[in-house]
Interface confidence: low
């Protein structure tokens, strides 16, 4: 079965620059299929733009200005690239690649889409590092004791643009765990978002990872934020006691990553 | 030119209660086209659900049913037992691939229908409230409440900033919420929640430690380790790529 990956979740450009959006095809030979590109402008319908067929023929949608979009494919890397020249405000959109995939039964085909790349146009001069800056929160003792479960929270701040994907995994597993997240929020010229994962008591002694995909991650790779295992077998309850007021009973440890 | 028009812009559905989405074709007979349905979820992922001739995407056949009403020139998609996973924007799209004669292999899309999922009506449930802290950051975690209306207050005299709470459906079909803020006096911040004409405080749920061994941090990278009131780490952790440390005893 064909699968499409768009490695860039967003691409930020200044006006009149050129944007190159990539689509990696797997599970099917790129030179044996047609790749289609669609765009979804804010508030508009998803619209076909251009396709490149198995024999290299390029077909553009009528009404699309010539010279605006260029599509090609590189069989060696199984990649199709959509090039958008002279980007302008009306190019702000999410761009999807797609292909027809044959189902088990003859003649039955479905069109599958890549995850999309959002083209962002900015003229802000932003700080050099606008990758997501993580802060981790470990489960409160009260939650682990009372509910036999614990919630990890992963806060990501000071990133730009606003497009970000967060998922959670156990350390040595590729299974994506069911998590919850808040909306992406604007703070001055950058954004913040948080995601949380509640795990049963039996999983608290495992290491968990909050995995973050963002355009400006260092070296373009997903950022992995490690949540250490928790020991839960040593706590006693005293519901009347507000421990945060007991200075003798708190040791605050803050380690902050400030490396480049 | 043909146009696909969804019946509604937004459709609120309740968990477990069947829902129907409709999409009518303007300017052409729907029988001349194949109809497709897609779902776009958070993060823009476009997932194929259904194509005419009984083709379903992986995992959709049991909970979705596609149909065409030739007489009314519309396409129908039924969600048989909605769950919180079914929240998203649903798009109808058409093509003529494989119909013979003049065909188009491009999809023509309609506008999306936003499906919002709400928990089923159920007995009211009081939330549990927990506070999590790291440096100046404080998170108030509010778990398993119903109905949705809630006010979350992080109580502090030295607020730096606060963010709107995130309220989501919990896996059990109630609501969870998190409110985040930054405070100069994060140590003393508590959380109080107004729900169903009652106030619930995080202090109602607090516990006392007898031991020093709750958090067992491992070597981490690219993280800020938590400042936890009530937790006594056994030792200062030597962490790679960390070059700033503050200790408050």
């Amino acid at each position: 079965a064909g699968h499409l990956e768009q490695p860039q979740i967003s691409s930020t450009k200044t006006l009149s620059k050129t944007a190159r959006l990539e689509c990696v095809v797997s599970g099917i030979t790129i030179s044996a299929t047609s790749v289609y590109w669609y765009r979804e402008r804010p508030g508009e319908v998803i619209q076909f733009l251009v396709s490149i067929s198995y024999d290299g023929t390029v077909r553009k949608e009528s009404g699309i200005p010539s010279g605006k979009f260029e599509v090609d494919r590189i069989p060696e890397t199984s990649t199709s690239t959509l090039t958008i020249h002279n980007v302008e405000k009306q190019d702000i959109a999410t761009y999807y690649c797609a292909l027809w995939e044959a189902q088990q039964e003859l003649g039955k085909k479905i069109k599958v889409f890549g995850p999309g790349t959002k083209l962002i146009i900015t003229d802000k001069q932003l700080d050099a590092d606008v990758s997501p800056k993580p802060t981790i929160f470990l489960p409160s003792i009260a939650e682990t004791k009372l509910q036999k479960a614990g919630t990890y929270l992963c806060l990501l701040e000071k990133f730009f643009p606003d497009v970000i994907k967060i998922h959670w995994q156990e350390k040595k597993s590729n299974t994506i765990l069911g998590s919850q997240e808040g909306n992406t929020m604007k703070t001055n010229d950058t954004y913040m978002k948080f995601s949380w994962l509640t795990v049963p008591e039996k999983s608290l002694d495992k290491e968990h990872r909050c995995i973050v995909r963002h355009e400006n991650n260092k070296n373009g790779v997903d950022q992995e934020i490690i949540f250490p295992p928790i020991k839960t077998d040593v706590i006693t309850m005293d519901p009347k006691d507000n421990c945060s007021k007991d200075a003798n009973d708190t040791l605050l440890l803050q380690l902050t990553n400030t490396s480049a | 030119a043909i146009e696909l028009v969804p019946e509604h812009q937004t459709v609120p559905v309740s968990i477990g209660v069947p829902a129907t989405l409709r999409c009518s074709m303007k300017g052409e007979a729907i029988g001349n086209y194949y109809i497709n349905w897609y779902r776009k979820t958070q993060g823009n992922t476009m997932t194929f659900i259904y194509r005419e001739k009984d083709i379903y995407g992986p995992g959709f056949k049991d909970n979705f049913q596609g149909d065409i009403d030739i007489a009314k020139n519309l396409a129908v998609l039924k969600i048989l037992a909605p769950s919180e996973r079914d929240e998203g924007s649903y798009y109808c799209a058409c093509d003529t691939l494989g119909m013979g004669g003049e065909y188009t292999d491009k999809l023509i899309f309609g506008k999306g229908t936003r499906v919002t999922v709400e928990p089923r009506s159920q007995p009211h449930t009081k939330p549990s409230v927990f506070v999590m802290k790291n440096g100046t950051n404080v998170a108030c975690l509010v778990k398993e409440f119903y109905p949705k209306d809630i006010r979350i207050n992080l109580v502090s005299s030295k607020k730096i900033t606060e963010f709107d709470p995130a309220i989501v459906i919990s896996p059990s079909g109630k609501y969870n919420a998190v409110k985040l803020g930054k405070y100069e006096d994060s140590n003393s911040v508590t959380c109080s929640v107004q729900h169903d004409n009652k106030t619930v405080h995080s202090t109602d749920f607090e516990v006392k430690t007898d031991s020093t061994d709750h958090v067992k941090p491992k070597e981490t990278e690219n993280t800020k380790q938590p400042s936890k009131s009530c937790h006594k780490p056994k030792a200062i952790v030597h962490t790679e790529k960390v070059n700033m440390m503050s200790l408050t005893v």
Epitope: L15, P42, G43, K89, I92, I120, I121, D123, K124, K186 | -
Partner: antibody, heavy 124, light 112 residues
Framework: EVQLVQSGAEVKKPGSSVKVSCKAS????????ISWVRQAPGQGLEWMGG????????DYAQKFQGRVTITADKSTSTAYMELSGLRSEDTAVYYC?????????????????WGQGTTVTVSS | DIVMTQTPLSSPVTLGQPASISCRSS???????????LSWLQQRPGQPPRLLIY???NRFSGVPDRFSGSGAGTDFTLKINRVEAEDVGVYYC?????????FGGGTKVEIK
């Protein structure tokens, strides 16, 4: 499509206040800056101030500081402009304006979409 | 405040002929981020203003290509290369480099 719908015309006495509303539809309200601009009869355009609802902190032109209050209600996607101590020279059409949905949300200065205008007449 | 001065005050033109409006700012409109936040708006009789050009020369979507903007620093020009009847109205330049946002006094384009 983004639309801004303003409240109806007002006739006010000198010294009183007027509050004009501007309801946004068709897009995220929070992140886009709403500007208030006025135009006296036969005159040009004058920027009074603006607000990004997410932040809730307005920016005012010095000329109107102390007399104008700009607010936003996120729950109803509505921005408000209240002008107090009205005098006859405040007779004008008051417009709200904001970027369209194609604009990144920090284009404070963009005024792609305009309300229909609210006529405020100050007369004794 | 930055003062925006437009000339001429009024511009009577023949249909199909070009028109040119000038706008001068009291100080440079080059922002510290390198951009020049100079826009042109059109206001037809009885209507709210409408954005035509942003950042000196970028045409807003849906604006006919007979409208063009040029200039730099403190001197800017809006050109209509063949005036049509629907172009009648008042044209304003506006700066957003500095608070408060300020507008030119307007130039009335009318048909001879």
């Amino acid at each position: 499509e983004v639309q801004l719908v303003q409240s109806g015309a007002e006739v006010k006495k000198p010294g009183s206040s007027v509050k004009v509303s501007c309801k946004a539809s068709g897009d995220t309200f929070n992140n886009y800056a709403i500007s208030w601009v006025r135009q006296a009869p036969g005159q040009g355009l004058e920027w009074m101030g603006g607000i990004i609802p997410f932040f809730g902190t307005p920016d005012y032109a010095q000329k109107f500081q102390g007399r104008v209050t700009i607010t936003a209600d996120k729950s109803t996607s509505t921005a408000y402009m209240e002008l107090s101590g009205l005098r006859s020279e405040d007779t004008a059409v008051y417009y709200c304006a904001r970027p369209g949905s194609g604009s990144p949300d920090y284009y404070y200065y963009d005024m792609d979409v305009w309300g229909q205008g609210t006529t405020v007449t100050v007369s004794s | 405040d930055i003062v925006m001065t437009q000339t001429p005050l009024s511009s009577p033109v023949t249909l199909g002929q070009p028109a040119s409006i000038s706008c001068r700012s009291s100080q440079s409109l080059v922002h510290s981020d390198g951009n020049t936040y100079l826009s042109w708006l059109q206001q037809r009789p009885g209507q709210p203003p409408r954005l035509l050009i942003y950042k000196i020369s970028n045409r807003f979507s849906g604006v006919p290509d007979r409208f063009s903007g040029s200039g730099a620093g403190t001197d800017f020009t809006l050109k209509i290369n063949r005036v049509e009847a629907e172009d009648v109205g008042v044209y304003y330049c506006m700066q957003a480099t500095q608070f408060p946002l300020t507008f030119g006094g307007g130039t009335k384009v009318e048909i001879k």
